[in-house]
């Protein structure tokens, strides 16, 4: 997708729905493209992106991409259509309400990516698999 300052006029009258028949409307996502980041060796990080965009299309989801090489760390935040690959990878977790980072194989760098479908969900990127649970007892163990 494209950030709001260069958005085109679109008028798609089709109502987009999810698998349960719920109406999908344009989502709110953090949208700072690529920025240098200090996020490293943490269970989760905030994006520190102050730009919240209304995604261009109802089917788009929030995406975050974390990359580390010998020189720097960057965090990319965008809206993207999960039917299309991003950085040559399928957005397999697009229906998740939280942005749970998954490592991807990229030569010469450490590369993590997540996608999610709740408003501004790419503001909080989660590296620890412990967060990926709906078990309250487990959460008690994590945070005690």
């Amino acid at each position: 997708t494209i950030p709001p300052h260069v958005q085109k006029s679109v008028n798609n009258d089709m109502i987009v729905t999810d698998n349960n028949g719920a109406v999908k409307f344009p989502q709110l996502c953090k949208f700072c493209d690529v920025r240098f980041s200090t996020c490293d060796n943490q269970k989760s990080c905030m994006s520190n992106c102050s730009i919240t965009s209304i995604c261009e299309k109802p089917q788009e989801v929030c995406v975050a991409v974390w990359r580390k090489n010998d020189e720097n760390i960057t965090l990319e935040t965008v809206c993207h259509d999960p039917k299309l690959p991003y950085h040559d990878f399928i957005l397999e977790d697009a229906a998740s309400p939280k942005c749970i980072m998954k490592e991807k194989k990229k030569p010469g760098e450490t590369f993590f990516m997540c996608s999610c479908s709740s408003d501004e969900c790419n503001d909080n990127i989660i590296f620890s698999e412990e967060y990926n649970t709906s078990n309250p007892d487990l959460l008690l163990v994590i945070f005690q």
Epitope: E56, S118, C121, D123, N124
Partner: antibody
Framework: QVQLVESGGGLVEPGGSLRLSCAAS????????MSWVRQAPGKGLEWVGR??????????DFAAPVKGRFTISRDDSKNTLYLQMNSLKTEDTAVYYC???????WGQGTLVTVSS | DIQMTQSPSSLSASVGDRVTITCRAS??????LNWYQQKPGKAPKLLIY???SLQSGVPSRFSGSGSGTDFTLTISSLQPEDFATYYC?????????FGQGTKVEIK
């Protein structure tokens, strides 16, 4: 289709309290930031406040005239948004709309009248 | 808070006229601007978001332009159902503030 239905409005004396509800259906409520916007009789639109998704911490923000008096909460299990209004003033008289934050869906509004 | 100023506050026009409403922000808001239409006794309806993106189902005679501090809503050929009040709203920062409204009346 998407529906937002407000309830709980009515006549209340200055200094009193009222709780508005907004029942949401037709979309994944838990995934959406929600807002309240009000409109005094014959006046323009005024943003009241918002609540973010529980996934992003459920943080709330308020307009200066209502800060400290109004609170917003949500019950994702009931697909319901709430606006708790305390220490009401005559200038809070308005139609209150529940809205999907910054987007196209609004409720029909509920009238709150603060008068002695 | 960012102040939004609309002009004119009201205008009279005839069916078929081209109508332009302007909205000025007190500081740069990039393209974070929405336009709403409201008819008496009804909830506002979103017409344009992100300054120029037409909301699904909105007729193409409505268009939005601008960035930074100056924005325009244009109705290329006014129709009977377009007589209403129009509001701009910035979504660049909290609180998201509205303009005072522009009432479009029948001449």
């Amino acid at each position: 289709q998407v529906q937002l239905v407000e309830s709980g409005g009515g006549l209340v004396e200055p200094g009193g309290s009222l709780r508005l509800s907004c029942a949401a259906s037709g979309f994944t409520f838990s995934n959406a930031h929600m807002s309240w916007v009000r409109q005094a009789p014959g006046k323009g639109l005024e943003w009241v406040g918002r609540i973010k998704t529980t996934y992003s911490g459920g943080a709330t923000d308020f307009a200066a005239p209502v800060k400290g008096r109004f609170t917003i909460s949500r019950d994702d299990s009931k697909n319901t948004l709430y606006l708790q209004m305390n220490s009401l003033k005559t200038e809070d008289t308005a139609v209150y709309y529940c809205t999907l934050d910054l987007r196209q869906y609004w409720g029909q509004g509920t009238l709150v009248t603060v008068s002695s | 808070d960012i102040q939004m100023t609309q002009s004119p506050s009201s205008l009279s026009a005839s069916v078929g006229d081209r109508v332009t409403i302007t909205c000025r922000a007190s500081q740069s808001i990039s393209s974070y601007l929405n336009w709403y239409q409201q008819k008496p006794g009804k909830a506002p309806k979103l017409l344009i978001y992100a300054a120029s993106s037409l909301q699904s189902g909105v007729p193409s005679r409505f268009s939005g332009s601008g960035s930074g501090t100056d924005f325009t809503l244009t109705i290329s050929s006014l129709q009977p159902e377009d007589f209403a009040t129009y509001y701009c709203q910035q979504s660049y920062s909290t609180p998201p503030t509205f303009g005072q409204g522009t009432k479009v009346e029948i001449k």
